[in-house]
């Protein structure tokens, strides 16, 4: 994922409890990862800016048959105001860059932790 710095509000901003649950789920995924996550599937990288939750879902929804991220997909759909289906792409995708799901999750986790801290202290 790109644009880790200088991000705008990720709109819509989920309540801190829901954000905390999403972060906990991503932590579980990264900690419990033994074999390559989702068999090393590749997804489009995204810009971590406004609309990030929908963009993340649009990327991850194209990964099928990976039970490890199903809960994450469901949680992200709760943060995205519109229906997302496989093959859908927004301008937030960095269309020339694909990364492994494991790296996508790690980058998203790092960014969401920053958002959580921001929300806590501001």
């Amino acid at each position: 994922l790109t644009c880790l710095g200088g991000f705008a509000s990720p709109g819509p901003v989920p309540p801190s409890t829901a954000l905390r649950e999403l972060i906990e789920e991503l932590v579980n995924i990264t900690q419990n990862q033994k074999a390559p996550l989702c068999n090393g599937s590749m997804v489009w990288s995204i810009n971590l800016t406004a609309g990030m939750y929908c963009a993340a879902l649009e990327s991850l929804i194209n990964v099928s048959g990976c039970s490890a991220i199903e809960k994450t997909q469901r949680m992200l759909s709760g943060f995205c105001p519109h229906k997302v289906s496989a093959g859908q792409f927004s301008s937030l995708h960095v269309r020339d860059t694909k990364i492994e799901v494991a790296q996508f999750v790690k980058d998203l986790l790092l960014h969401l932790k920053k958002l959580f801290r921001e929300g806590q202290f501001n």
């Epitope: 932790k113 921001e118 501001n122």
Partner: antibody, heavy 120, light 107 residues
């Protein structure tokens, strides 16, 4: 190895202000929130406040009625806690503490403590 | 503010004993609870976070349990180095609050 090194002991007069520093190493300073905890002699632990070093946003305990100012200097990886209008009951050891909220908890690592004595 | 009521405030035990310390929150804290050990003149040391997760390097005789408002720290077989004061902390919401502490003394 994560390390938090605090400034040395201080003796202050009532009404004065004390500023304690906490220099960190072993992790990226902006990755974890930083908190300050007070422990009066023979007493328990009390959370004073904390800061997100990335943004400078703070939260503090109303018990200290605006006397606490917490800051962070990203250029030196150092956090500061300033306590003003000191009174005798502020005599205590002050700790800085940090950690990953989601991976060890926000108080996983502690400084060695700084004794502040308030006496006329 | 969330109140954390820790009990007992002190206890006497022997090496090898099973020791249980409890912490009760005034409202649901979503298991955002840590346990600390403190020895005289030293900074607290983190033992447990998220109610039941053991901090790296902490002996497995320490364990945490509970959810909602009621939490427990258990030392399965007390060792000489475990005589200390123990504190719980809720970090579910600001202001973060500690329990009053439990001093574990030698019987």
């Amino acid at each position: 190895e994560v390390q938090l090194v605090q400034s040395g002991a201080e003796v202050k007069k009532p009404g004065a202000t004390v500023k304690i520093s906490c220099k960190v190493s072993g992790y990226t300073f902006t990755d974890y929130e930083m908190h300050w905890v007070q422990q009066a002699p023979g007493k328990g632990l009390e959370w004073m406040g904390g800061i997100d070093p990335e943004t400078g946003g703070t939260a503090s305990n109303q018990k200290f009625k605006g006397r606490v100012t917490i800051t962070a200097d990203k250029s030196t990886d150092t956090a500061y806690m300033e306590l003003s209008s000191l009174r005798s009951e502020d005599t205590a050891v002050y700790y800085c503490t940090t950690g990953d909220y989601f991976g060890g908890g926000p108080f996983a690592y502690w400084g060695q403590g700084t004794l502040v004595t308030v006496s006329s | 503010d969330i109140q954390m009521t820790q009990s007992p405030s002190s206890l006497s035990a022997s090496v090898g004993d099973r020791v249980t310390i409890t912490c009760k929150a005034s409202q649901d804290i979503n298991s955002y609870l840590s346990w600390f050990q403190q020895k005289p003149g030293k900074a607290p040391k983190s033992l447990i976070y998220r109610a039941n997760r053991l901090v790296d390097g902490v002996p497995s005789r320490f364990s945490g349990s509970g959810s909602g408002t009621d939490f427990t720290l258990t030392i399965s077989s007390l060792q000489p180095e475990d005589f200390a004061t123990y504190y719980c902390l809720q970090y579910d919401e600001f202001p973060y609050t500690f329990g009053g502490g439990t001093k574990v003394e030698i019987k």
